[in-house]
């Protein structure tokens, strides 16, 4: 509340997050031409990355391109990329949509289609849809512990969201436990009016807002956080602006003295913790 | 503009970036004592890292130290590091400039020079200049899409820099398209009065400032971002304060049951997206 | 100091850090059933990670689980996890404390204890204490160079903490050299009234506050940073809220056609650089 007589000061904040949970992933795996059901367990070291402070990322889906090697190959035949003769292919050309540099030759991609040959990590990534339902859809049941230390330097006041009286086996609930700082990911989405199962396919960005409205006067002291949640990415975004949230990373290795990589396109939820508020004192 | 009757509130911001582009890298590669011209393609998974929010990094140059193993070896003979007898070498000493711990012995580095033996990742990193021109100098033509979601919680107002009417194939231009949020890296440097080709050698830090000056009164509503660019690292910095921008990281592997690593000293541009501004309402 | 006639503006800040130092680590290593003393050198690429801006992390301790593979195994017999018959084990159950999914069978963990069999990365991580003293306790002598560029856009004023007159071989000292921006990690802890050796075991979060109180009026211009230090994690935190600072990450590889990983639980100090302050001008 606005107390005009008070000296207001913005909050200085530090955040530490800890995600817990394991996911069971079942997918079709092809080895030596044989496709069989693959089953694996993902724990925190597999689906999240050591990130700093105000953000954490949980992988909910992925597409793998295994055993890529630097060589020449036909580019992926996405819309408008097919060719019938070398005239259509321009040596040295880098199409922003493509993953390589054209050699100038038009070569067979498969029995029916031809595309421009490129120098690239080959075979080039197939532009296939993210798996639906999402492979790590069970991430909905993961929990995150959020620790937030705040400081008003001008008032020489420091506090944190976790008090000694709190119970480490609680789960945040807007009504029943609004001060608990352990959040179930599915609940965050529900509070924000979003469908976790749906967002998990393409990924997205979710904001966890922590609002500190602190009255630091001794006679009416109050300084506790209020949590709220809102989706930060635009779910109605045009394809050309890359909807959802994903990034590519690679695992490199050597086989028969040739450098290879497995390319992973990781879709997931990036959670941004947005801390704001003021401390007021007479 | 300052409207003194308005209640001003600082912006709460979330940023998402997506870099696009491929680079063709040609460099001398030595294998089995034979030096030949190596040619490779770098895509986003090779030159950028999954980073959070307000920063992204594009590698523009690198120096590799391949096949390092934990053992004893002569340290690199940089200025003042040579020795003629064991007296010059102090067992257990860690020179901050060196990469290992001295054993106390003075040993031959090559046919003409001797240096103190160290326990380290060997052979120790050669202190050679970053390649000039930069290996990924073509990163100048990469583009970055910046998505920025902003919120004024006190005014319960949210918006973003990308509007539904925008065209996903645009490129930012200060005059012709100042609202487009797809930026060519070379253009960012040009706007900031900097030379990309030059900075790419040693690396640097570039600020992309997004200024929101929002009038939220319904009768004169305005809330769109203004982009500006400025270099954040000090190009005139003394050697001792580590000019440019680089960091080292390692790829670990096993060979004949011995743990080895390839050390990469990555030079590049870190782009910091600095979002600021206020929302005012009567 | 508060000059009421001035127009105040919050600082816009960009930070770049560079850690220096090497650590000698001695630990027991078991190979082929034989335990012997292992000795290794850690340099920046081994103990720190390429992180963005306002945070950097220094690993001070670790626990490794080597050669894990996705299979079935008995879960770790932590308190309350033992079983005597299959009735105690529930097929498909994921205990939040466990690292896998139960198969429903109760199997021998060792000669004396039985636990529920799980599908997991096996053998499952042993829940053992972090080594004491910390393996990289010598990180106390590492140094960090902090470069801070600040901007008051409304006043069109930019400066940085490192001036051309500064000496790159200085070390920060509150009294003798309060403007030097090279900090010994142990000194930061001492200034904050904390014991580095103790915190290094479990990890922690340390704040480096940079306060800019800038008077930008030409007749009494002053704009230099003031550094202060305070611990941000709660050292008295209950076990259930995960005291200290650690995260798990994995190194993946293939052996005998099976994907394996080495899981590293990294304990360390996350340093948060908190820049705040205002620029005032008539």
């Amino acid at each position: 509340s606005d107390k005009l007589y008070q000296r207001k000061e913005p909050v200085i904040s530090s955040v530490h997050t800890k995600v817990k949970g394991i996911a069971e992933v079942t997918e079709n795996v092809t080895e030596g031409g044989v496709t069989k059901l693959g089953h694996s367990i993902f724990d925190t070291a597999d689906y999240t990355f050591p990130l700093q402070g105000n953000s954490f990322f949980v992988m909910t889906n992925y597409v793998k391109s295994e055993g890529q090697v630097q060589t020449l190959c036909p580019e992926y035949p996405r819309r408008g990329a097919q060719c019938s003769s070398d005239r259509r292919c321009k040596k040295g050309w880098m199409d922003p949509q493509s993953k390589g540099i054209q050699t100038g030759r038009c070569v067979p991609y498969d029995k029916t289609r031809k595309t421009c040959e490129v120098s690239a990590w080959c075979p080039t990534e197939e532009e296939k849809e993210a798996p639906r339902p999402a492979l790590l859809r069970s991430a909905e049941n993961f929990t995150v512990l959020i620790k937030n230390n705040i400081h008003f330097p001008g008032h020489n006041y420091t506090t944190r969201n976790i008090l000694p009286t709190m119970n480490g086996s609680c789960t945040f609930h807007k009504t029943w436990d609004p001060q608990c700082s352990i959040f179930r990911l599915g609940d965050i989405f529900q509070e924000a009016g979003e469908n976790f199962t749906e967002v998990a396919v393409q990924g997205g960005i979710m904001g966890i807002e922590i609002y500190w409205d602190c009255n630091l006067d001794s006679w009416s002291h109050h300084c506790r956080p209020r949590y709220s949640f809102r989706r930060l990415d635009d779910k109605n975004m045009d394809e050309s602006f890359v909807p959802g949230y994903n990034f590519r990373y690679a695992k490199y290795y050597k086989e028969n003295n040739v450098e290879k990589r497995t390319l992973i396109k990781a879709f997931g939820i990036r959670f941004d913790i947005l801390v704001f508020g003021t401390g007021g004192k007479f | 503009s300052d409207k003194l009757y308005q209640r001003k509130e600082p912006v709460i911001s979330s940023v998402h970036t997506k870099v696009k582009g491929i680079a063709e890298v040609t460099e001398n590669v030595t294998e089995g004592g034979v030096t030949k011209l190596g040619h490779s393609i770098f895509d986003t998974a090779d030159y950028t890292f999954p980073l959070q929010g307000n920063s992204f990094f594009v590698m523009t140059n690198y120096v590799k130290s391949e096949g390092q193993v934990q053992t004893l070896c002569p340290e690199y003979p940089r200025r003042g590091a040579q020795c003629s007898s064991d007296r010059r070498c102090k067992k257990g000493w860690m020179d901050p400039q060196s990469k290992g711990i001295q054993t106390g012995r003075c040993v031959p580095y090559d046919k003409t020079r001797k240096t103190c033996e160290v326990s380290a990742w060997c052979p120790t990193e050669e202190e050679k200049e970053a390649p000039r021109p930069a290996l990924l100098r073509s990163a100048e033509n990469f583009t970055v899409l910046i998505k920025n979601n902003i919120h004024f919680p006190g005014h319960n107002y949210t918006t973003r820099n990308i509007l539904p009417t925008m065209n996903g194939s645009c490129t930012f231009h200060k005059t012709w398209d100042p609202q487009c949020s797809i930026f060519r890296l070379g253009d960012i440097f040009q706007e900031a009065g900097e030379n990309f080709t030059e900075v790419a050698v040693q690396g640097g830090i570039m600020g992309i400032e997004i200024y929101w000056d929002c009038n939220l009164d319904s009768w004169s509503h305005h809330c769109r971002p203004r982009y500006s660019f400025r270099r954040l690292d000090d190009k005139n910095m003394d050697e001792s304060f580590v000019p440019g921008y680089n960091f080292r990281y390692a790829k670990y592997y096993k060979e004949n049951n011995v743990e080895k690593r390839t050390l990469i000293k990555a030079f590049g541009i870190r782009f910091d997206i600095l979002v600021f501004g206020t929302g005012g309402k009567f | 100091s508060d000059k009421l006639y001035q127009r105040k503006e919050p600082v816009i800040s960009s930070v770049h850090t560079k850690v220096k130092g090497i650590a000698e680590v001695t630990e027991n290593v078991t190979e082929g059933g034989v335990t012997k003393l292992g000795h290794s050198i850690f340099d920046t690429a081994d103990y720190t990670f390429p992180l963005q801006g306002n945070s950097f992390f220094v690993m001070t301790n670790y626990v490794k689980s080597e050669g894990q593979v996705q299979t079935l195994c008995p879960e770790y017999p932590r308190r309350g996890a033992q079983c005597s018959s299959d009735r105690r084990c529930k097929k498909g159950w994921m205990d939040p404390q466990s690292k896998g999914i139960q198969t429903g069978r109760c199997v021998p963990y060792d000669k004396t204890r039985k636990t529920c069999e799980v599908s997991a990365w096996c053998p499952t991580e042993e829940e053992k204490e972090a080594p004491r003293p910390a393996l990289l306790r010598s990180a106390e002598n590492f140094t960090v160079l902090i470069k801070n560029n600040i901007h008051f856009p409304g006043h069109n004023y930019t400066t940085r903490n490192i001036l051309p007159t500064m000496n790159g071989s200085c070390t920060f000292h509150k009294t003798w050299d309060p403007q030097c921006s090279i900090f010994r990690l142990g000194d930061i802890f001492q200034e904050a009234g904390e014991n580095f050796t103790e915190v290094a075991v479990q990890g922690g979060i340390m704040g480096i506050e940079i306060y800019w109180d800038c008077n930008l009026d030409s007749w009494s211009h002053h704009c230099r940073p003031r550094y202060s230090f305070r611990r941000l994690d709660d050292k008295n935190m209950d076990e259930s809220f995960v005291p200290g600072y650690n995260f798990r990450y994995a190194k993946y590889y293939k052996e005998n056609n099976v994907e394996k990983r080495t899981l590293i639980k990294a304990f360390g100090i996350r340093f948060d650089i908190l820049v705040f302050g205002t620029g005032g001008k008539f």
Epitope: H39 | - | G67, L72, V258
Partner: nanobody
Framework: EVQLVESGGGLVQAGGSLRLSCAAS????????MAWYRQGPGKQRELVAD???????NYADSVNGRFTISRDNVRNTVYLQMNGLKPEDTAVYYC??????????????WGQGTQVTVSS
Amino acid sequence: EVQLVESGGGLVQAGGSLRLSCAASGSFFRVNVMAWYRQGPGKQRELVADITRGDRTNYADSVNGRFTISRDNVRNTVYLQMNGLKPEDTAVYYCYATIELGVLEPRDYWGQGTQVTVSS
């Protein structure tokens, strides 16, 4: 139907060597622990050696240093290389494996056994 099929047993002189192999066949999801047990005349069945899917090995004290267990994860086969054989190694050697038929459906399987006889 999942089966474990052993081979490689036989008669050998003391100090000699043999290599046993055992292949899992049929339709299943994953082979986990594989092992060799033996049962000498008038004795109980005892563990000789086992090997996890991650190639961690464990040996009975009586064979440590003489026998080597290994596996091939492509062929779902386990091997036992037996060197420096002694008369007391005479037994029927049984292959054992924990095999998941489907996800979270482990079963323990035994081979029929193969006779190893060491003459002095």
